[in-house]
Interface confidence: medium
């Protein structure tokens, strides 16, 4: 990947794509500046991942300015929370992990207000980005789905996210071509059952998305990204 942004400096509230090992470039926001006093995070930014609402510390070499990179990295992807993240970075860039637009963390408050650029003409964005959850490295590995439908894409789109039982007849309102596809889709769901059932209502998808450290190889990730282009609908429940 290009490292032309290695020397780029970011400020609190900046919108970026963040690259973590084994994961696609993920829509994210800079939530905290590097603190030289903290050895483990020196020269690293705390980033908040849209869609999953998790955080991690990343160096500038793994961060890419959102506006410049969205054409390259902003394509729908099958990873859980990715498409939602794309929507959030465009439509709700100040979202917090709790779902509340509350006051900023102290680490961001000292920064001058950052007015996010007006993406896709969305005129009602707020000012600077706000805080994130304090948890680091708690994200669950999103195992690649083994089964794909006949078109080679995963069926996970809003309006079709719930799993059907294997013998459940197809929704009559669904696309006609899907009748032959549903058999391959059983068991694929945007969120693991444990997360959905046990998470707090304010963070329904906590525990998803790019982890702080990931062992999955870049080669596998690249393969998944290629497979994922043109993700269809969330026909999986």
């Amino acid at each position: 990947m290009s490292r032309s942004n290695r020397q780029k400096e970011y400020k609190c509230g900046d919108l970026v794509f963040a690259k973590m090992k084994g994961y696609p470039h993920w829509p994210a926001r800079i939530d905290e500046m590097p603190e030289a006093a903290v050895k483990s995070t020196a020269n690293k930014y705390q980033v908040f991942f849209f869609g999953t609402h998790e955080t991690a510390f990343l160096g500038p070499k793994d961060l890419f300015p959102y506006e410049e990179s969205k054409e390259k990295f902003g394509k729908p992807n099958k990873r859980k929370g990715f498409s939602e993240g794309l929507w959030e970075i465009e439509n709700n860039p100040t979202v917090k992990a709790s779902g509340y637009q509350s006051s900023q963390k102290k680490s961001c408050a000292a920064e001058p207000e950052v007015e996010p650029e007006d993406h896709e003409g969305d005129g009602d964005k707020k000012g600077s980005a706000e805080g994130s959850s304090d948890e680091e490295g708690k994200l669950v590995i999103d195992e690649p789905a083994k089964e794909k439908n006949e078109k080679g894409t995963l069926k996970r789109r809003a309006g079709d996210v719930l799993e059907d039982s294997p013998k459940r007849p197809k929704e009559s309102g669904d696309h006609e071509e899907e009748d032959k596809e549903i058999a391959a889709l059983e068991g694929e769901r945007p969120l693991p059952v444990e997360v959905e059932k046990n998470s707090t209502p304010s963070e329904p998808d906590s525990g998803q998305g790019p982890p702080a450290e990931e062992e999955e190889g870049e080669e596998e990730a690249a393969k998944e990204e290629a497979e994922a282009q043109g993700v269809r609908d969330h026909e999986s429940l």
Epitope: P76, E84, L86, G121, D160, L162, E171, G173, D233, H234
Partner: antibody
């Protein structure tokens, strides 16, 4: 700024076809992940989802109305269309279009609505 | 089809009150729930998506919670501008709206 505006014939006779137009700005229906949903509301009643057209034409319809509905789009002119093949008096309602994104989010931005009255 | 039920069709409250509007799904919808506000002039706005996430520009006095089949919208400090009808909507299997709860001032 994202805006949507519906337009239609206003009054139409029963059993006739109707074509409603949603003209929008601030987003494109050729952008991956974007859709336009159609919703209606009979006078004094609640909202009813009718259909959704996605950027890739992989569309969805309300099962109870599917046989009478068809959605289409003109991406170059930023327009989405809802065709009701044969209207009935029960189709009298305010019709809305709304922008929707591909995953786990709501009908984010709505038009102001257009009234369709089915009357002989 | 998934049915959405808002058992309270109308609700009267005083300014400054904390108001909770409930919504029930006919099956587990795994937090795939949105809330909308429709003003008397017909204008519709998305308030909350995915059970609890505030849409851009929505005041923080609005909050959402719930899981499984039961969900709620809470307005913590009722203001005159909140007078509207509120609809829940599931998007787990196609899209279905609840019948709406009309909020009025006492």
């Amino acid at each position: 700024q994202i805006t949507l505006k519906q337009s239609g014939p206003g009054i139409v006779q029963p059993s006739q076809p109707v074509r409603l137009t949603c003209t929008f700005s601030g987003f494109s229906l050729s952008t991956s992940g974007i859709g336009v949903a159609w919703i209606r509301q009979p006078s004094g009643k609640g909202l009813e989802w009718l259909a959704t057209i996605w950027w890739d034409d992989d569309n969805r319809y309300n099962p109870s109305l599917k046989s009478r509905l068809a959605v289409s789009k003109d991406t170059s002119n930023n327009q989405a269309f809802l065709n009701i093949i044969t209207v009935e008096t029960a189709d009298t309602a305010i019709y809305y279009c709304a922008q929707i994104y591909d995953y786990a989010v709501g009908f984010a931005y709505w038009g102001q609505g257009t009234l369709v009255t089915v009357s002989a | 089809d998934i049915q959405m039920t808002q058992t309270t069709s109308s609700l009267s409250a005083s300014l400054g009150d904390r108001v909770t509007i409930s919504c029930r799904a006919s099956q587990d919808i795994s937090n795939y729930l949105n809330w909308y506000q429709q003003k008397p002039d017909g204008t519709v706005k998305l308030l909350i998506y995915y059970t609890s996430r505030l849409h851009s520009g929505v005041p923080s006095r609005f909050s959402g919670s719930g899981s499984g089949t039961d969900y709620s919208l809470t307005i913590s400090n009722l203001e005159p501008d909140d007078i509207a009808t509120y609809y829940c909507q599931q998007y787990g299997k196609l899209w279905t709206f609840g019948g709406g709860t009309k909020l009025e001032i006492k």
